[in-house]
């Protein structure tokens, strides 16, 4: 129209999908009466009447907006509910009097996309690929308008780079009018990218301003050839016989190559392949000194059949040999002397100790134990321990039994046993001596004898308690080539008064087994024996 002023830019109204847009008719009173207004939507330059205002009363026109429009603010504002992306268009209000004027509103619609979904290449990427390979995909669903995607590596944005980085993106429109953005990052990776963190970021706008959403960070499997092979031994430090030792072959390539572990044979000077488990680990359990030697690992790239060899590694399994004691079975007369010598070999310096078997008392630190003026009590076990002080737990022991010649020695001289008449009584009698004594009983019954050790014997007698037995008691006699000795067991009938324990007697009806701690001895031989000492 000649002379008509150029149309002013429409007023911008920004709103999120699903919310209500308030379209305020900006006509001034001079431009038109707001009680008589027509509202139009403009789509592809085509106007469609959508709402009429007459005398301040609103009326929707049939069509897509029929159910979503209402008047607010005394008729000056048109409210559009449940905004969709399809509502992004120009709306205009037109006043009727005094002359037809219009006011245009541009509705802009926004929707934040969902969290970006990143998926990494599950098969990985070789470093020697001829062109950029697919690293990861990123999907941002249901945004409006189309969000922008930025890819990051280790926190830095990635830019298109010829033959190095390529980002390919596309979008699809859902039936809702929202956009789904799909992007794929293609890149040529290097070995150092094996630990690189990739993520994608979606940038989008809302009425409140610019926003962004980040995906989780991912690492991509990167394949690169092996350049170096080496051996690792567990546990670290000094190894000893009996340890579980793992010899593991390692390589700096991904995927790991095929490994074989071999051990040098000192006699043939050739390497012999060892049998590894499924993981290529050689397990030595228990480790033995024969496992000591020089190990090396060969790694094979099955694609190229190129092999790499590790630096050889010396393995030392420390050991202590069997301990030898001389004399091996010593016998001595009372009063004499004895020298016990201990020997062993080891891969390390050895320390020797002599201990008394019964008490674990340390008698000597060193390989030689000197015993003088031997008493009967000196008989028994002596243990030599050969150990490597620098390797805890590496030791071997040898036990030697010293026998002191002497007549039988009884565990007790006499003892009281509480009994009931007609009960079967189980009596026991213990004696020691060298040569080993035999035990006999002065009453008939079922006797059984068992060795406690080479110098000690225990005899058990099952006997019926009779009045005669109660009167005479029971004697056991131990004898050997050097003499004999007797113990007496007195039998006492149980009655109510005698059930009170007496400190000097054995009460109760339990098996009468002599205690080895109280020893009282006399002998029928002419040889003078030393006074008994308490042992243990």
């Amino acid at each position: 129209v000649p002379g008509e002023a150029e149309q002013p830019a429409p007023e911008l109204v920004e709103v999120e999908v699903g919310s209500t847009a308030l379209l305020k008719c900006g006509l001034s009173q001079s431009q038109g009466n707001l009680s008589h207004v027509d509202w139009f939507s403009v789509h592809k330059e085509k106007r469609t009447l959508i709402f009429r205002v007459r005398q301040g009363q609103g009326q929707s026109e049939p069509g897509e907006y029929e159910q979503r429009l209402s008047l607010q603010d005394r008729g000056a504002t048109l409210a559009l509910t449940q905004v969709t992306p399809q509502d992004e268009r120009i709306f205009l209000c037109q006043g009727k009097r005094p002359r037809s004027q219009e006011y245009r509103i541009q509705l802009r619609v926004y929707k934040a996309p969902e969290e970006p979904n990143i998926q990494v290449n599950p098969l990985g990427i070789p470093v020697n690929s001829k062109e950029p390979e697919e690293v990861a995909t990123c999907v941002g669903r249901n945004g409006y308008p189309i969000p922008q995607v930025i890819w990051y590596k280790n926190g830095r944005p990635l830019k298109e780079e010829k033959n190095r980085v390529h980002i390919q993106s596309s979008q699809t429109v859902e039936s809702s009018g929202l956009y789904t953005l799909q992007s794929i990052l293609k890149a040529q990776l290097v070995k150092e990218d094996k630990d690189a963190q990739f993520y994608c970021e979606l940038n989008y706008r809302l009425p409140s301003g610019n926003h962004m959403k980040e995906s989780r960070e991912v690492t991509v499997p990167v394949f690169y050839p092996t350049e170096k092979v080496w051996l690792e031994v567990e546990p670290v430090g000094m190894l000893k016989e009996g340890d579980r030792v793992e010899i593991r072959c390692l390589a700096d390539g991904n995927p790991p190559p095929h490994f074989s572990i071999s051990k040098g044979n000192p006699s043939t000077r050739e390497a012999e392949e060892e049998t590894t488990n499924d993981n290529g680990v050689l397990v030595l359990e228990p480790a033995r000194k024969e496992h000591s030697g020089r190990y090396e690992c060969q790694a094979w790239n099955l694609d190229t059949m190129i092999s790499l060899l590790s630096e050889p590694q010396e393995l030392l399994v420390n050991y202590v040999s069997d301990v030898r004691v001389s004399p091996a079975a010593p016998e001595r007369q009372e009063g004499s002397s004895l020298t016990l010598t201990c020997e062993a070999e080891s891969s390390q310096d050895l320390e020797f100790q002599w201990l008394r078997e019964e008490t674990d008392q340390v008698l000597e630190r060193g390989p030689v134990l000197q015993l003088h003026d031997l008493k009967r009590e000196a008989g028994g076990g002596y243990r030599c321990v050969a150990s490597v002080p620098s390797i805890p737990g590496l030791n071997r022991t040898q036990l030697v039994k010293l026998a002191i010649f002497g007549p039988p020695w009884m565990a007790f001289k006499e003892r009281k046993v509480w009994v009931k008449e007609n009960m079967v009584l189980n009596l026991s009698c213990e004696a020691s001596g060298h040569p080993r004594p035999t035990i006999s009983w002065n009453v008939n019954g079922t006797a059984s004898e068992g060795d406690q050790d080479p110098q000690r014997v225990l005899s058990t007698l099952n006997v019926l308690v009779t009045p005669e037995l109660l009167e005479t008691g029971v004697e056991c006699t131990a004898s050997n080539d050097l003499g004999k000795n007797t113990s007496i067991l007195f039998l006492e009938l149980v009655n109510l008064t005698t059930l009170t324990p007496d400190s000097n007697t054995t009460t109760g009806l339990s098996t009468s087994t002599a205690s080895p701690h109280t020893r009282a001895n006399s002998t029928s031989t002419e040889r003078k024996l030393p006074e008994p000492e308490s042992r243990g």
């Epitope: 599950p122 098969l123 690929s129 697919e134 794929i184």
Partner: antibody, heavy 118, light 106 residues
Framework: QVTLKESGPVLVKPTETLTLTCTVS????????VSWVRQPPGKALEWIAA???????YYNSAFKSRLTISRDTSKSQVVLTMTNMDPVDTATYYC????????????WGQGTLVTVSS | DIQMTQSPSSLSASVGDRVTINCKAS??????LAWYQQKPGKAPKVLIF???SLQTGIPSRFSGSGSGTDFTLTISSLQPEDFATYYC????????FGQGTKLEIK
Amino acid sequence: QVTLKESGPVLVKPTETLTLTCTVSGFSLTSSGVSWVRQPPGKALEWIAAISSGGTTYYNSAFKSRLTISRDTSKSQVVLTMTNMDPVDTATYYCARRYGYGWYFDFWGQGTLVTVSS
Amino acid sequence: DIQMTQSPSSLSASVGDRVTINCKASQNIYNSLAWYQQKPGKAPKVLIFNANSLQTGIPSRFSGSGSGTDFTLTISSLQPEDFATYYCQQFYSGYTFGQGTKLEIK
């Protein structure tokens, strides 16, 4: 539209080599990767090998030493060879397209049943 | 290797039923999971990708959920054409499929 079609022998003898061809249309092998997946009768699906849009080859480690996958982009064909066939390799062999913006298979061939028997 | 375990291995249901099929991964696979439907003598067809995204052209009665190690395929109202075998597949590290769930008519 996108189609994939497998072709190759229906019967192979033990120890022989199987060669299967997947001919594709409706997309370019330089824009989408292709995988081979097999399914023994009455059993589950098993991924065998893949070739990416960039030409990188991938193999299931269970078969790696027996497999070769290659492509001829001008003929729109992907070829799988599997050596030293065994009766346990009897299966329906499928080729499948990897979706361009994901890692799942959006289009499959109809499959070809390969029987290994003497 | 990541193992995928489906349950149940077979399932009987009637038209109109709501059906759920479970899939468990041996390690965290985030949402790198797809569901396929396979009918006898036919190739598998993708239903769901990225654990919960519906493939174009698949009816909305199919839905997927879960992340990490536990996933579910749900058919909200079973139709006659839905009787088939269903497979889950992980694509987080390599490709492995579940052993399948056969959905039969009761």
